[in-house]
Interface confidence: medium
């Protein structure tokens, strides 16, 4: 998607985007909190399709990790989180049961703030 | 996910999330930037699962709609602006081709900055 | 010209209600900070709550705290004070004031009375 | 918070006079975060010096103010019949609580 940078623009908390295996993710967290196994293929109508996912969070090594950008200071307190999504993914529950299931992924880098009282 | 607002936070950008199907979604962008249809079944193994996504983008009614909250007027101007990510879904191409493609969906609400010139 | 020009001061009963507002000109209003000080006939000058330039962040003397609300709108260079279950000690001159960026007040209105008694 | 007390409550003074008022703060008021302001009856206060020692734009010269810590001066150094008046400092390193001192009334002697 277009690059924020080539407008002249910068991002109040800088992020990293990659692109996720199943082989590398293993488990992941479904929308009632529990622990799945993201399953490495998917069963398509061809044979098999590996799965993967496109994952941003929050850079550790960019220059937010202090707090965020362009934040007034003298009222507030700041930090980049990242946000996670749901995506669907052929998953296996804790009781060997396979099947779709909305797992979270981290897909932002957003910021938050809390206000500094009483400095 | 944990509400920010629950720990005394504030988000810089005012976001809303849905779940939108692929019948209220109809078309989508591709990875190679082509508009694909977006299927509303997938098959499964038992059947069909409904096709759906989870969606997060600005909220048009927030209160930063004006610019991001928090943000140091004196350096930045600021803007909250959606932002996108990929997920797979079941889709047809111009030429009716099905297949399994990477879409683009809306994933998140973050601030971009851009620094004021000249005061 | 940079002005600040009060207004909605009145005579109110105790436990009443009243807004002042306060209209800004000749500067960016959304660019500053701002604030309410008030003063007692015969006293000195008593901070009683400032606002940021967006209106998110908010503070306020612990006198009018949960009684009083700041408040900003942006596009019509307006800031506010609603002040509720008035009482006989907040009888004051109420003025509006510019903030520069560290807090201190450039700019001052002419100030608006609010009695409180019965 | 911090308390500042300002001295003498009252000044009297001649025109033509130098007038030097102090205002003490309860703790540290670190990279001289203090102002003075000047209140003429039934008027709005007039900010004369910011940082402890600059003076805002269209003070006339014969204002100045000094100090640092704990310790600020307001001096003026030939007093004009318009100098008359009250005199506050306010404190804005350490907020909120903004606060000012109680003033002191400058007075023809």
């Known amino acids: 998607h277009s690059d924020p940078a080539r407008r002249g623009e910068l991002s109040v908390c800088d992020s990293i985007s990659e692109w996720v295996t199943a082989a590398d993710k293993k488990t992941a967290v479904d929308m009632s909190g529990g622990t799945v196994t993201v399953l490495e293929k998917v069963p398509v109508s061809k044979g098999q399709l590996k799965q993967y996912f496109y994952e941003t969070k929050c850079n550790p090594m960019g220059y937010t990790k202090e707090g965020c950008r362009g934040i007034d200071k003298r009222h507030w307190n700041s930090q980049c989180r990242t946000t996670q999504s749901y995506v669907r993914a052929l998953t296996m529950d804790s009781k060997k049961r396979i099947g779709w299931r909305f797992i979270r992924i981290d897909t932002s880098c957003v910021c938050t703030l809390t206000i500094k009282r009483g400095r | 996910h944990s509400d920010p607002a629950r720990r005394g936070e504030l988000s810089v950008c005012d976001s809303i999330s849905e779940w939108v199907t692929a019948a209220d979604k109809k078309t989508a962008v591709d990875m190679s930037g082509g508009t694909v249809t977006v299927l509303e079944k997938v098959p499964v193994s038992k059947g069909q699962l409904k096709q759906y996504f989870y969606e997060t983008k600005c909220n048009p009614m927030g209160y930063t709609k004006e610019g991001c909250r928090g943000i140091d007027k004196r350096h930045w101007n600021s803007q909250c602006r959606t932002t996108q990510s990929y997920v797979r879904a079941l889709t047809m191409d111009s030429k009716k081709r099905i297949g399994w493609r990477f879409i683009r969906i809306d994933t998140s609400c973050v601030c971009t900055l851009t620094i004021k010139r000249g005061r | 010209e940079v002005q600040l020009l009060e207004s909605g001061g009145d005579l109110v009963q105790p436990g009443g209600s009243l807004k002042l507002s306060c209209a800004a000109s000749g500067f960016t209003f959304d660019d500053h900070d701002m604030s309410w000080v008030r003063q007692a006939p015969g006293k000195g000058l008593e901070w009683v709550s400032a606002t940021s330039t967006d209106g998110y962040a908010t503070y306020y003397a612990d006198s009018v705290k949960g009684r009083f609300t700041i408040s900003r709108d942006n596009s019509k260079n307006t800031l506010y004070l609603q002040m509720n279950s008035l009482r006989a000690e907040d009888t004051a001159v109420y003025y509006c004031?510019?903030?520069?960026?560290?807090?201190?007040?450039?700019?001052w209105g002419q100030g608006t009375t609010v009695t409180v008694s019965s | 918070e911090i308390v500042l007390t300002q001295s003498p409550a009252t000044l009297s003074v001649s025109p033509g006079d130098r007038a030097t008022l102090s205002c003490r703060a309860s703790q540290n008021v670190r990279s001289s975060k203090l102002a003075w302001y000047q209140q003429k009856p039934g008027q709005a206060p007039r900010l004369l010096i910011y940082?402890?020692?600059t003076r805002a734009t269209d003070i006339p010269d014969r204002f100045s103010g000094s100090g640092s810590g704990t310790d600020f001066t307001l001096t003026t150094s030939s007093l004009e019949p318009e100098d008359f008046a009250v005199y506050y400092c306010q404190q804005y390193y350490d907020w909120p609580p903004l606060t000012f001192g109680g003033g002191t009334k400058v007075e023809i002697k």
């Open positions: 004031a510019k903030l520069d960026y560290y807090y201190y007040m450039d700019v």
């Open positions: 940082g402890a020692s």
